[in-house]
């Protein structure tokens, strides 16, 4: 017996004292376990287990299915085993046809033998097909045939266990190998929309798509900075052998403002993890925010074009947009379009195209937009810059010379006296009175300026120039004087355009 220390428990003895034993089919299996602390016999083969509390295990008529490992255990938990082969020429293999292999791992084709003395125990392809060239295996009569390092290419491979018996090849039932792919990359995750904007009470539903090589990929929706379990629904598909897709749909049937936040779809496999987020913003009611793309005070030269451009955020979608000038609505000359074609876009652009503006077309141009919840407006003050125009130039009864000019910006009127017939009027004359007229109205049209000088100051023949100018241009009017005796006579005045 094996050497043991005195008093130290030893494993039980099994008779007959062999590690492996062959019994013919139909014969009796008789095994004796000798141990003062005998507890039980256990029989195991494939997934079957039996127990026996008698110290002598007896099977009166052995069958092939009695092939297996018989273990005797004593009260100290020590055990000894014998493996019994029940030789049955009609049933050379015991089979468990379920055959799953994990990629890159070994897997066992479970076809243990009932006769260990047969030869050439191996694997063969079904219907005479050869096995893959790189398929390596190790036969073990008690367990089956171990396929080494399973490849993805072996998926759905049809196999038989095979032995030679009396010179003939005998095949087991067929096995179909199902390969569970190894994860060699993180899952691919995507989300139906990156952001959601909802009003209180509306349903929030977002779908995460998880793609991987097999269904054992783990996925979940999580709320950032929260451990609360979210309600999800799943749909899944196998697109071919190693192309699995799952859709995890997260739904909040009636969203509240405090549901706003970042939601993460997280997936992981044995290789690693991946995630994608979507942002939910829940507002108590809709909104419109308008952003002018140009200054709301616009200066434009007479005859030129200008585009009034706004961007605006509208949620829900805008329903009515209009541009208004002087209580009139534009039916054309404007366009309104979404800033992007993105499904979650809430930003829009509206452009009013004003062409060849006249001086009379300055004023307030208003953009109005509304949705089902709110209205909003923005006004542009448009000033049309015009060259001064001299409206009147007269000698008044009180002896004053008066010049009235209109333009925008407000013109400045200067007076010059030219003695004799000189063309250049350089000597400036200070006005007696300067007034800006019609300043009580909105300052969008032309501004009218009136300037007067006292003609009594002129003692000689000559020309008086009234020059009106602003940033856009200048215009002059002339008064010609001739003295007849003591009388001063105004000759018809005339204007001279100076660009």
């Amino acid at each position: 017996q094996p050497s043991v220390s005195p008093g130290e428990p030893s494993p039980p003895s099994i008779h007959p004292g062999k590690s492996d034993l062959i019994v013919r089919v139909g014969d009796e299996i008789r095994l004796l376990c000798t141990d003062p602390g005998f507890v039980k016999w256990t029989f195991e083969i494939l997934d079957e287990t039996n127990e026996n509390k008698q110290n002598e295990w007896i099977t009166e008529k052995a069958e092939a299915t009695n092939t297996g490992k018989y273990t005797c255990t004593n009260k100290h938990g020590l055990s000894n085993s014998i493996y019994v082969f029940v030789r049955d020429p009609a049933k050379l293999f015991l089979v468990d046809r379920s055959l799953y292999g994990k990629e890159d791992n070994d897997t066992l084709v479970r076809c243990p033998l009932t006769d260990p003395e047969v030869t050439n125990y191996s694997l063969k392809g079904c219907q005479g097909k050869p096995l893959p060239k790189d398929l390596r295996f190790i036969p073990d009569p008690k367990a089956g045939i171990m396929i080494k390092s399973v490849k993805r290419a072996y998926h759905r491979l049809c196999l038989h266990c095979s032995v030679d018996q009396e010179g003939k090849s005998v095949l087991s039932e067929k096995f179909i190998l199902k390969v569970r792919p190894a994860f060699k990359a993180v899952p691919v995750v995507s989300v139906s929309k990156a952001s959601y904007l909802l009003r209180e009470g509306e349903e929030f539903t977002v779908t995460c798509t998880i793609k991987d090589v097999s269904s054992s990929v783990y996925s979940t929706w999580k709320r950032e900075n929260s451990q609360t379990k979210l309600q999800e629904k799943y749909n899944s598909w196998h697109h071919g052998d190693f192309n699995y897709e799952r859709q995890a749909t997260l739904t909040i049937s009636s969203a509240r403002v405090n549901d706003s936040g970042v939601f993460m779809c997280y997936a992981n496999n044995t290789f690693g993890s991946a995630n994608v987020t979507t942002t939910l913003e829940v507002v108590d009611k809709g909104f419109i925010n308008i952003f002018p793309m140009i200054n709301t005070t616009v200066f434009v030269n007479d005859g030129e074009n200008v585009d009034l451009i706004v961007e605006y955020e509208a949620f829900p979608k805008p329903e009515h947009q209009q541009w208004i000038y002087m209580n009139r609505t534009f039916t054309d000359k404007w366009e309104d379009y979404p800033k992007s074609e993105n499904e979650s876009n809430i930003r829009y652009v509206s452009e009013l195209h004003l062409t060849r503006l006249k001086g009379t077309e300055g004023g307030t141009y208003t953009f109005l937009v509304s949705n089902s919840d709110v209205n909003a407006a923005i006004a542009f003050n448009v000033y049309v810059n015009t060259k001064p125009e001299i409206l009147t130039y007269d000698r008044l009864v009180n002896g004053m010379l008066q010049c009235v000019a209109a333009g925008f910006p407000e013109p400045t009127i200067d007076w010059y006296f030219c003695p004799g017939t000189e063309q250049r009027c350089s000597a400036s004359v200070l006005p007696v009175d300067v007034q800006t007229l019609n300043s009580s109205g909105p300052p969008f049209g032309k501004l009218v300026v009136q300037s007067s000088i006292d003609s009594s100051a002129f003692k000689h023949n000559g020309t008086v120039e009234c020059k009106a100018y602003n940033d856009v241009g200048k215009t002059s009017a002339y008064f010609n004087f001739a003295f007849k005796g003591n009388n001063k006579e105004q000759i018809h005045p005339h204007t001279l355009f100076t660009p």
Epitope: Q1, P16, K18, S19, D20, I58, E117
Partner: antibody
Framework: EVQLVESGGGLVQPGGSLRLSCAAS????????MDWVRQAPGKGLEWVGR??????????EYAASVKGRFTISRDDSKNSLYLQMNSLKTEDTAVYYC????????????WGRGTLVTVSS | DIQMTQSPSSLSASVGDRVTITCRAS??????LNWYQQKPGKAPKLLIY???SLQSGVPSRFSGSGSGTDFTLTISSLQPEDFATYYC?????????FGGGTKVEIK
Amino acid sequence: EVQLVESGGGLVQPGGSLRLSCAASGFTFSDADMDWVRQAPGKGLEWVGRTRNKAGSYTTEYAASVKGRFTISRDDSKNSLYLQMNSLKTEDTAVYYCAREPKYWIDFDLWGRGTLVTVSS
Amino acid sequence: DIQMTQSPSSLSASVGDRVTITCRASQSISSYLNWYQQKPGKAPKLLIYAASSLQSGVPSRFSGSGSGTDFTLTISSLQPEDFATYYCQQSYIAPYTFGGGTKVEIK
């Protein structure tokens, strides 16, 4: 050639010791369970004892008549089986055979020619 | 220990005769029984194992039967080379005891 050859027999006085050897060849000795069987002159066969292989944890078993006096051992690296006989008695006089058990049954499918041990004063 | 009782202890027979030797175990040994042939000055030779399985190279005139406690070795047609002593042996529980032997002699 598959064979077993015993050696080490001879004349020994009662109370003496002797070591028998069995040299194996032609098969994988380390896989085999091995036995000693003896036959007294003009008598029948008597099983002496056995040693299991490595798979059987080299367990040894003995006949009651020799237990405590005889020890069976093996050296797989030398393909050799041994029988150490101590406290020899006259009734231990016999031809001692080394025998091989097949892998899957306890019988003796290969025997040596035997070596004679004579215990006499 | 299990006792093995063989009978007869000797028999005389002629070439061509059918010879039967019996062996009885003191308790059930299932099919754990072997038969050996020994000729004078030679080592024993295995004939039958597991009660009825013929050892490779042994002529088919030798056969074994029985299970439990009673076993039989039969030589269907005795040949000159078959004159020898025959032993049964149980291999169920150590010590692996032999029967006393049956000597088959020429009549």
